[in-house]
Amino acid sequence: ESGYAQNGDLEDAELDDYSFSCYSQLEVNGSQHSLTCAFEDPDVNTTNLEFEICGALVEVKCLNFRKLQEIYFIETKKFLLIGKSNICVKVGEKSLTCKKIDLTTIVKPEAPFDLSVIYREGANDFVVTFNTSHLQKKYVKVLMHDVAYRQEKDENKWTHVNLSSTKLTLLQRKLQPAAMYEIKVRSIPDHYFKGFWSEWSPSYYFRTPEINNSSGEMD
């Protein structure tokens, strides 16, 4: 009876959409890399479903993912990072769907941090600086950053600036006087690796000076 029930489960499983997406993070914990996968459909019943990666691994043929609520996760030093791996959704020994992926093409950098803005009165500008853990990494060192800022009252009116360094100067005359601004930054691999935008850094808030009426400049 139990065998019949399992067969029925398998037939039901084959009707579902098991499409998934993954991202890798290299040297995320010392020399350890991570790989995170999740189903595109949040309503998929993940009971009894497992993820497995095979190929382009060091010393082992395959590795199983750990399940953390609705995501599947591996942290390991065993990714060769050369060539394609096969990532499969499995129920028991049966593969439901698989994708061949080079882990160096699905890299999601860590979010930038320590974002700050300093106003320079003499220069009439704002110096934006932030930090990234990728400066110390062996592999994903070259990133493109996206700095986004908006006046706090403008809900969806973000201005974006792309840059490869971790320092940006905003001219005071380009900003509204006596206004509160929100600013944040994210990163994406640039050169040698491909992938996705990082999460946004925590936002930083700063206020622009008021206009000095006698000179027409901001205070």
Epitope: C54, G55, N86, D102, Y139
Partner: nanobody, 118 residues
Amino acid sequence: EVQLVESGGGLVQAGGSLRLSCESSISTFSSDAMGWFRQAPGKEREFLAAIGWSGAVTHYSDSVQGRFTISRDNAKNTLYLQMNSLKSEDTGRYYCAEDYDTDVWQYWGQGTQVTVSS
């Protein structure tokens, strides 16, 4: 029809250097992993070095680490193997391979002969 062509082999004295090239006519070269192997007389083919699609990641066997350097030029569809401090045991036929897909190399060249004399 010919897809991978190795060149640069020859006779060299122990301690000398050679640079092998492998030209690919495979359209996906710039997104494929590449590797070098050798087969010594009477022995199985052995892995020497591999390189990721962009050149950022490389991997070497213990036998050539520190002496051989793998590199690639995606604009020229060409793979290289710089071999320094050559030893007599480096003698053999050198093959390049392309597209490392789930632990199987999909394409192989015909090889180029390297002979190291002592």
